[in-house]
Interface confidence: low
């Protein structure tokens, strides 16, 4: 018995061939011997089966001795043995129809679980293997689960259903809702304007939800909400904003915040969360602000940084075009009785300068100038 696998919602064509290459009488029946369709001369006739409005044949092939049964918009319950009667012969074809669906929405938050459920006809024992867009392989039976979805899981999942050594392939598009970056760090000199951007890693026609940015300043004992906002069809409207700092938020995506001045008291870490309508859970992005200040007080030239710096970062003070006078893996360095000239304070990581601040030291009878 020939086995044919079909996909729910698809169209399948079951073949039936006579030895005579001409139009002769044929009938297609199901396993209950109920006629589905056949011919009377050159006319297509249909029986009382439940496939009535979804069954068809190709009259153009009858003259060649081919009498296919076409079933449109396949349903799991169409799984059956179909019998073609032609020339006193019976050809049997077993049709097995499978469906594969995602548990809920195909738009899932990063960290959530994806469950794929296989609909299969009674008596079948299929196995399923799915390959994620990043090449991960998942195998299972009637259900497959993937926990802790990552951004790289966005895209087309290709699932192969295997039954009776036959395969049928399903493609399911999954969108993992996340920010492009889990974390970002901004380095600024004291007084500079700060721009925070939170680009999303997905696009949808309508995006509605609400969000907030909580900030933990390095100098503060507890975090505070800097801003809360609503998102309606990709339009941003601020609900509440802290008075200090005076944050501004862009009205369009990507989510964009401006801090007018980088000050030591603002240095620290923030967590932006976004709750999307009709989704449980939230999207998160961490953002960090490092602020540098170079000052001269009496005979002491000091360079300081505030905020979340890694222990391997180097802070240096050097006179322009000269060797560093002082270089330490610390958050503050200083030089006593600095020579007159343009001094540079550098924050660097493995030789790469992340932040630079210049201060002009004048001869001792003058006051310092910060360019």
């Amino acid at each position: 018995k020939k086995v044919v696998l079909g996909k729910k919602g698809d169209t399948v064509e079951l073949t039936c061939t006579a030895s005579q290459k001409k139009s002769i009488q044929f009938h297609w029946k199901n396993s209950n011997q109920i006629k589905i369709l056949g011919n009377q001369g050159s006319f297509l006739t249909k029986g009382p089966s439940k496939l009535n409005d979804r069954a068809d044949s190709r009259r153009s092939l009858w003259d060649q001795g081919n009498f296919p049964l076409i079933i449109k918009n396949l349903k799991i319950e169409d799984s059956d043995t179909y019998i073609c009667e032609v020339e006193d012969q019976k050809e049997e074809v077993q049709l097995l129809v499978f469906g594969l669906t995602a548990n809920s929405d195909t738009h899932l938050l990063q960290g959530q679980s994806l469950t794929l459920t296989l609909e299969s006809p009674p008596g079948s024992s299929p196995s399923v293997q799915c390959r994620s867009p990043r090449g991960k392989n998942i195998q299972g039976g009637k259900t497959l689960s993937v926990s802790q979805l990552e951004l790289q899981d966005s895209g087309t999942w290709t699932c192969t259903v295997l039954q009776n050594q036959k395969k049928v392939e399903f493609k399911i598009d999954i969108v993992v809702l996340a920010f492009q970056k889990a974390s970002s760090i901004v380095y600024k000199k004291e007084g500079e304007q700060v721009e925070f951007s939170f680009p999303l890693a997905f696009t949808v026609e309508k995006l509605t939800g609400s969000g907030e940015l909580w900030w933990q300043a390095e100098r503060a004992s507890s975090s505070k909400s800097w801003i809360t906002f609503d998102l309606k069809n990709k339009e941003v409207s601020v609900k509440r904003v802290t008075q200090d700092p005076k944050l501004q938020m862009g009205k369009k995506l990507p989510l964009h915040l401006t801090l007018p001045q980088a000050l030591p008291q603002y240095a620290g870490s923030g967590n932006l969360t976004l709750a999307l309508e009709a989704k449980t859970g939230k999207l998160h992005q961490e953002v960090n602000l490092v602020v540098m200040r170079a000052t001269q007080l009496q005979k002491n030239l000091t360079c300081e940084v505030w905020g979340p710096t890694s222990p391997k970062l180097m802070l240096s003070l050097k006179l322009e075009n000269k060797e560093a006078k002082v270089s330490k893996r610390e958050k503050a360095v200083w030089v006593l009785n600095p020579e007159a000239g343009m001094w540079q304070c550098l924050l660097s990581d493995s030789g790469q300068v992340l932040l630079e601040s210049n201060i002009k030291v004048l001869p001792t009878w003058s006051t310092p100038v910060q360019p």
Epitope: S127, Q129, P133, R134, G135, K136, N137, Q139, L151, Q152, D153, S154, G155, T160, L162
Partner: antibody
Amino acid sequence: EVQLVESGGGLVQPGRSLRLSCAASGFTFSNYGMAWVRQAPGKGLEWVATISYDGSITYYRDSVKGRFTISRDNSKNTLYLQMNSLRAEDTATYYCTREEQYSSWYFDFWGQGILVTVSS
Amino acid sequence: DIQLTQSPSSLSASVGDRVTITCRASQSVSISSHDLMQWYQQKPGKAPKLLIYDAFNLASGVPSRFSGSGSGTDFTLTISSLQPEDFATYYCQQSKDDPYTFGQGTKLEIK
């Protein structure tokens, strides 16, 4: 220590059959996909077939589809390659490989290889 | 099928040299920023040995003088300081698409 030992190679006439075996040890065989990779004398490497950890899914290169069958017996920690309708171009050293399937797909352990010669 | 082209096909070098082998794919082997490219080393009469997976990850037990880089269609295997045991043939391999394909190989010989 991971070990893969192939057997069953030799000289065979075109059109005939041969079955290669690969005995695996040193790892949980039933947790890993396995594959066969071949190398014609003096030539490069060519992937032949892959089988999933439980044997439910198999993949073949087009030139061997319908002629070769990859299978496994997890209770015996053994991988097989049944080769039918052999052709001269199937002459090669056949390597049994363990296929890591959790990130990229790659062959992290290889057997020493077994020579299959198809000639009349 | 994805074709992989290695260059050079053969290369003569001395112990201590820095050597670079490139592999170009006929189409991208990246999936969601994940590069499905491997490098193997094969010595005469021996089975291949995995050196690098996912374009840049060093396989277990492989010396740190070997490194991989690249993304999309262009990949590089670098040996920072050749050792006598490194003279062999090197193959790149993609596993983005069925069938998995290998480069034609680069034979590294002693100068």
